[in-house]
């Protein structure tokens, strides 16, 4: 008996030929030997299957001899065998239809569990093996699960059904959504406009939720909620913003706000949190502003940075052109009685500059002048 | 070569039957169908009924259903097909088309029926 | 039951003139569907058969193509003989329902 694999809601086509190579009469019939379709000469008869409205054939194939019964919107219980009657002979066909689900939904945040749930005939005994859009495989029986989902897990997934040394290959589409960094800092120098920008790492046709920004300066005690806001279907609307800082959002994704000015009292790390709706949990985004500013306040030439730095970083003091006069691991460094000329303090890591803010120092006789 | 050779003209009483035949040559008359059209004066085709000569098996369109019966002689190769409760409306050519391999690829000639008091 | 809709339903052109009739089933029919020529006081004529198949002794220049729920019939170059109504059915579900027909005539 011939063993054909079918999926949920596809098409198959089982194929019957006769010998002679004309249009002859013939017909299917499933295992209960209730009539399928047949032909009347030229013309397609059906029986009074449940399958009437979903059973076809092919009438241009039938002068070859070739009497293919097409099952459309496969379901489960469609898995039977199948007799196909033509010239005094039988041919039997066993179809097998199989179906692979995610739970729930292919859109998850980041972070939780998919699970694939494979549906199977009676009496089947199927092994399934999924492929991730990075390349990990898991196996497994009547349902797959993955934990902890990543970004990289976005994408199609391939799974493939075995069952009687035959296969039938599923993909589904798993969107993960997240932003498209963990993490982000930004380093701006004392006074700067600083913009913060919190892309999506998916696209959907309509998105719609709530979000908002935390943040806690390294000055203060605890945190502050810095601005609430509403997102429909792509348009963003602020809910409540403080008056201090007093930031400003775009209308439209990506999210994107903008604070005024980079001040010392402002710098530490923000937590952007985005609640999807029909979501139960939440999208995160870390966000850190570092802000430097250069000051001299009579003979001492300072450099400070605030807000959260690593401490492999180095702050620098230099005059243009020369060799750094000061260098250090650390969040503030000075120089007493600076020569006159352009100053530079210098956040670097690894040799890459990361933040820049000049100083002009003029001779002892005059003020110094801040470019 | 085949043929297919219908009976003549016929008037007819509102109420009444007519019975049409159909006389097949040149062909196994039981290893086809037979199938049946008429077509009303200016119209177009309309479907009816098919017959299987061999299993005496048929198939009418719903319309129909209750007042055509088709039946066949295969002592004379002859396929009849029978409406009655007659009404104006019914005043059409009537066909009988064999089911060839490909399709009803051979007619009669038909035969107009007239309903008229 | 299936409804057949022809387009147009009259039609003029002239001799060497392309042609083309549709047909549209109101349900996927697949390609159980023929189209027949009639001509005046004669019965009607099998010109294609399973949608595309051509049925012998039917010149070349017509030709069928559709499949699902549109359908159509070309006539690549006009004779004169070829002004007639033209006539698609179903072939896929009882009753075997016709098009309401489409006439060809000279321009």
């Known amino acids: 008996k011939k063993v054909v694999l079918g999926k949920k809601g596809d098409t198959v086509e089982l194929t019957c030929t006769a010998s002679q190579k004309k249009s002859i009469q013939f017909h299917w019939k499933n295992s209960n030997q209730i009539k399928i379709l047949g032909n009347q000469g030229s013309f397609l008869t059906k029986g009074p299957s449940k399958l009437n409205d979903r059973a076809d054939s092919r009438r241009s194939l039938w002068d070859q001899g070739n009497f293919p019964l097409i099952i459309k919107n496969l379901k489960i219980e469609d898995s039977d065998t199948y007799i196909c009657e033509v010239e005094d002979q039988k041919e039997e066909v066993q179809l097998l239809v199989f179906g692979l689900t995610a739970n729930s939904d292919t859109h998850l945040l980041q972070g939780q569990s998919l699970t694939l749930t494979l549906e199977s005939p009676p009496g089947s005994s199927p092994s399934v093996q999924c492929r991730s859009p990075r390349g990990k495989n898991i196996q497994g029986g009547k349902t797959l699960s993955v934990s902890q989902l990543e970004l990289q897990d976005s994408g199609t997934w391939t799974c493939t059904v075995l069952q009687n040394q035959k296969k039938v290959e599923f993909k589904i589409d798993i969107v993960v959504l997240a932003f498209q960094k963990a993490s982000s800092i930004v380093y701006k120098k004392e006074g700067e406009q600083v913009e913060f920008s919190f892309p999506l790492a998916f696209t959907v046709e309509k998105l719609t939720g709530s979000g908002e920004l935390w943040w806690q300066a390294e000055r203060a005690s605890s945190s502050k909620s810095w601005i609430t806001f509403d997102l429909k279907n792509k348009e963003v609307s602020v809910k409540r913003v403080t008056q201090d800082p007093k930031l400003q959002m775009g209308k439209k994704l990506p999210l994107h706000l903008t604070l005024p000015q980079a001040l010392p009292q402002y710098a530490g790390s923000g937590n952007l949190t985005l609640a999807l709706e029909a979501k139960t949990g939440k999208l995160h985004q870390e966000v850190n502003l570092v802000v430097m500013r250069a000051t001299q306040l009579q003979k001492n030439l300072t450099c400070e940075v605030w807000g959260p730095t690593s401490p492999k970083l180095m702050l620098s003091l230099k005059l243009e052109n020369k060799e750094a006069k000061v260098s250090k691991r650390e969040k503030a460094v000075w120089v007493l009685n600076p020569e006159a000329g352009m100053w530079q303090c210098l956040l670097s890591d690894s040799g890459q500059v990361l933040l820049e803010s000049n100083i002009k120092v003029l001779p002892t006789w005059s003020t110094p002048v801040q470019p | 070569q085949v043929q297919l050779v219908q009976s003549g003209a016929e008037v007819k009483k509102p109420g009444s039957s007519v019975k049409v035949s159909c006389k097949a040559s040149?062909?196994?008359?039981?290893?086809?169908?037979m199938h049946w059209v008429r077509q009303a004066p200016g119209q177009g085709l309309e479907w009816m009924g098919w017959?299987?000569?061999?299993?005496?098996?048929?198939g009418y369109a719903q319309k129909f259903q209750g007042r055509v019966t088709i039946t066949a002689d295969e002592s004379t190769s002859t396929a009849y097909m029978e409406l009655s409760s007659l009404r104006s409306e019914d005043t059409a050519v009537y066909y009988c088309?064999?089911?060839?391999?490909?399709?009803?690829?051979?007619w009669g000639q038909g035969t107009l029926v007239t309903v008229s008091s | 039951d299936i409804q057949m809709t022809q387009s147009p339903s009259s039609l003029s052109a002239s001799v060497g003139d392309r042609v083309t009739i549709t047909c549209r089933a109101s349900?996927?029919?697949?390609?159980?569907l023929a189209w027949y020529q009639q001509k005046p006081g004669k019965a009607p004529k099998l010109l294609i058969y399973?949608?595309?198949s051509l049925q012998s002794g039917v010149p070349s220049r017509f030709s069928g193509s559709g499949s699902g729920t549109d359908f159509t019939l070309t006539i690549s170059s006009l004779q004169p003989e070829d002004f007639a109504t033209y006539y698609c059915?179903?072939?896929?579900?009882?009753?075997?329902?016709f098009g309401q027909g489409t006439k060809l005539e000279i321009k």
């Open positions: 040149g062909y196994t008359f039981t290893g086809y169908y």
């Open positions: 399973a949608a595309s």
């Open positions: 349900q996927d029919i697949n390609d159980f």
């Open positions: 017959m299987n000569p061999n299993s005496g098996n048929t």
């Open positions: 059915q179903q072939s896929y579900s009882a009753p075997y329902t």
């Open positions: 088309a064999r089911d060839g391999v490909t399709g009803t690829d051979y």
